[in-house]
């Protein structure tokens, strides 16, 4: 889910009746993004 | 390799309880969204719960269908989010996933009946 | 809540040949950013759901160019441009920018 989306989160917004997360933000919180921005700490040895 | 594994599903009868784990590995964990779907057996597919990562303070979000009788957690030293499902109704009866929406488990099945 | 309305249901195809799938949204996807936040997940005979297309035309990935996502804010189309055998599942479409996230009921394709 790569793509050059900054990462930010500036909380919930809220309409009439229901609450919407900002801007689609599950891009930058996603497994595929974790994967390409941080090294796991303590990779399995083989 | 990216893993989800779910575990913790069986048989239940309505008004028990039962608690799902899935545990993770595989990709950095500590800022990753993660959410548990269920596929019912008319294979409807209904998202249930959503818990975000410490920064965001673990804000947690449910489907009206399931607030006040399902609880999302996760345990960041151990790679691993909880779905506490008390009160369970037949309507609850399914495979429950867990996603970061990219990748998904293999699901689990919960079946509540009398 | 929004509503995701696929049509068709179920869809036959003939290996070779292309398939479109329509999801319309009772509600603009589109956010202030640009983002369409519409989405494209199969889910094939006792597997899973994976993604295949995330923000209405990203191709997921490990996701052939067979597969593409088009639409406006509130009108989606998923495209195979020749199908495969490997194909046959149930295609849903997904909102995640409002609560409680939606899905579409389902398109069941499969092959003539």
């Known amino acids: 889910l790569a793509d050059p989306l900054d990462h930010r989160d500036a909380g919930d917004l809220w309409f009439p009746g229901e609450s919407e997360s900002f801007e689609d933000a599950h891009v930058e919180h996603s497994i595929s993004r974790s994967l390409l921005e941080g090294e796991i700490p303590f990779p399995p040895t083989s | 390799e990216v893993q989800l594994v779910e575990t913790g599903g069986s048989l239940v009868q309505p008004g028990g309880s039962l608690k799902l784990t899935c545990a993770t590995s595989?990709?950095?964990?500590?800022?990753?969204?993660l959410h548990w779907i269920r596929r019912s057996p008319e294979k409807q597919l209904e998202w249930v719960a959503q818990?975000?990562?410490?920064?965001?303070?673990?804000?947690?979000y449910y489907a009206e269908s399931v607030k006040g009788r399902f609880i999302v957690s996760r345990d960041d030293s151990k790679t691993t989010i909880y779905l506490q499902m008390n009160n369970l109704k037949e309507e609850d009866t399914a495979i429950y996933y867990c996603?970061?929406?990219?990748?998904w488990g293999q699901g689990v099945m919960v079946t509540v009946s009398s | 809540d929004v509503v995701l309305t696929q049509a068709p249901l179920s869809v036959s195809v003939t290996p070779g040949e292309s398939a479109s799938i329509s999801c319309r949204s009772s509600?603009?996807?589109?956010?202030?950013?640009?983002?369409?936040?519409l989405y494209w997940y199969l889910q094939k005979p006792g597997m899973s759901p994976h993604l295949l297309i995330y923000?209405?035309?990203n191709l997921a990935s490990g996701i052939p160019d067979r597969f593409s996502g088009s639409g406006s804010e509130t009108d989606f189309t998923l495209k195979i441009s020749e199908v495969e055998p490997e194909d046959v599942g149930v295609y849903y479409c997904?909102?995640?920018?409002?609560?409680?996230?939606?899905f579409g009921a389902g398109t069941k394709l499969e092959l003539k």
């Open positions: 996603t970061g929406l990219d990748y």
């Open positions: 595989g990709f950095p964990f500590s800022n990753v969204w």
């Open positions: 818990i975000k990562a410490r920064s965001d303070n673990y804000a947690t």
């Open positions: 509600r603009s996807l589109l956010t202030s950013k640009g983002i369409t936040s």
């Open positions: 923000r209405m035309s």
């Open positions: 997904a909102q995640f920018l409002v609560y409680p996230y939606t």
